[in-house]
């Protein structure tokens, strides 16, 4: 269950998806990577205040509880809800192949 | 991928399994929740340093461009990575009925 | 296993349009970095990149064609179309649908012949 | 456009031998080309990429090399179903271009 999409903070400074530009050495993927040269990364960032895109139960529970206990439990956490796929072009033994990444770009966000 | 296990910041100071005990009034749910009384919620609660239970390619990119832009991009955060399910007995319109919930108490972390 | 089939009219006159039908399997065009190229060779002759849609709708064509040439996806139904406009004897060649990861052409239809002729 | 020029239209070989399949690019494309072999009634099949990496599936008797604007398709110990033509293309900058081609024809 999505909760609330409203940021209280103000617009852009709650859980969403941003991008972020990385060349392979920035990943440390040079070694192993011919392709691309450079990924668009999509990645989830931003504040949880209560229950913004509360994934489920437990992240209202979180919420709940760092009300109370704000120095034992953090706050829900920004992270993918889901992924898109994404292929490399890999260096292997014997020359490259092509491998398709099905965790690596987040595609939509919420908070646990 | 789980990466490693180790916490180079010390015992029980990286992404582990917590327990908090929490009352019905503690959660909000003593309007509509009759057993159990106090909740034992396990949760996800610590740090993730560099590659650290990293829960997939995500987690690698994101420790890597937090360590290049540690302003812009946050560091992977301690969640779950599967639940443990849990039976309320719950207050309804005519009485009373037991429902299972799926994603309640966490049953294992990493970091994403 | 990656496979891709091209289907056309075969026969088209001069100064008409035509499209072309890539059906594809195996992979998914809405993971980044996949896209459909279109390539051609005259008979006997060389290779002549066309055009590429990718995964996010950044469409790219030859400079030379781009005027005449249009693609586009049904990304549900595996499928990636070239149209060309007003087609001239010189576009009779053998058409090709590649699957493209990033700039690499990894995968190749078996091809189409296409024949401009009155 | 860039151009990519395989001067040698055709080669003949002999089951055994080594040969080498060169290209030439008109300016300096780093190490952004493919080789592609295409035998008589087929469709093209990629061999290398980035100048000197093999596709999964290829024998190791094919080779690439070269940077900037030479680069060579090198068979070690050619057999008789390396009968084809193959042609290089670049992929550094916007169109891609594809070479000619070179015919290579067994004794």
């Known amino acids: 269950a999505r909760n609330g999409d409203h940021c209280p903070l103000g617009p852009g400074r709650c859980c969403r998806l941003h991008t972020v530009r990385a060349s392979l050495e920035d990943l440390g993927w040079a070694d192993w990577v011919l392709s691309p040269r450079e990924v668009q990364v999509t990645m989830c960032i931003g504040a949880c205040p209560s229950q913004f895109r509360a994934a489920n139960m437990h992240a209202q529970i979180k919420t709940s509880l760092h009300r109370l206990k704000p120095d034992t439990v953090p706050a829900p956490c920004c992270v993918p809800a889901s992924y898109n796929p994404m292929v490399l072009i890999q260096k292997t033994d014997t020359g490259v192949s092509l491998q398709t990444y099905d965790d690596l770009l987040a595609k939509d966000c919420h908070c646990i | 991928a789980r990466n490693g296990d180790h916490c180079p910041l010390g015992p029980g100071r990286c992404c582990r399994l917590h327990t908090v005990r929490a009352s019905l009034e503690d959660l909000g749910w003593a309007d509509w929740v009759l057993s159990p009384r106090e909740v034992q919620v396990t949760m996800c609660i610590g740090a993730c340093p560099s590659q650290f239970r990293a829960a997939n390619m995500h987690a690698q990119i994101k420790t890597s461009l937090h360590r290049l832009k540690p302003d812009t991009v946050p560091a992977p955060c301690c969640v779950p990575a599967s639940y443990n399910p849990m039976v309320l007995i719950q207050k309804t319109d005519t009485g009373v009925s037991l429902q299972t919930y799926d994603d309640l108490l966490a049953k294992d972390c990493h970091c994403i | 296993q990656v496979t891709l089939k091209e289907s056309g009219p075969g026969i088209v006159q001069p100064s008409q349009p035509f499209r072309l039908t890539c059906t594809f399997s195996g992979f998914s065009l809405s993971t980044s970095g996949i896209g459909i190229t279109w390539i051609r060779q005259p008979s006997g002759k060389g290779l002549e990149w066309l055009a590429t849609?990718?995964?996010?709708?950044?469409?790219r064509y030859n400079p030379s064609l781009k005027s005449r040439l249009t693609v586009s996806k049904d990304t549900s139904n595996n499928q990636a179309f070239l149209n060309i406009i007003t087609v001239e004897t010189a576009d009779t060649a053998i058409y090709y649908c590649?699957?493209?990861?990033?700039?690499?052409?990894?995968?190749w239809g078996q091809g189409t012949l296409v024949t401009v002729s009155a | 456009d860039i151009v990519m020029t395989q001067s040698q239209k055709f080669m003949s070989t002999s089951v055994g031998d080594r040969v080498s399949v060169t290209c030439k690019a008109s300016q300096n494309v780093g190490t952004n080309v493919a080789w592609y072999q295409q035998k008589s009634g087929q469709s093209p099949k990629a061999l290398i990429y980035s100048a000197s990496y093999r596709n999964s599936g290829v024998p190791d008797r094919f080779t690439g090399s070269g940077s900037g604007t030479d680069f060579t398709l090198t068979i070690s110990n050619v057999e008789s179903e390396d009968l084809a033509e193959y042609f290089c293309?670049?992929?550094?900058?916007?169109?891609?271009?594809f070479g000619g081609g070179t015919k290579l024809e067994i004794k």
């Open positions: 849609i990718w995964w996010d709708d950044d469409n």
């Open positions: 293309q670049q992929y550094n900058s916007h169109p891609v271009t």
């Open positions: 590649v699957q493209s990861a990033w700039d690499w052409f990894a995968y």
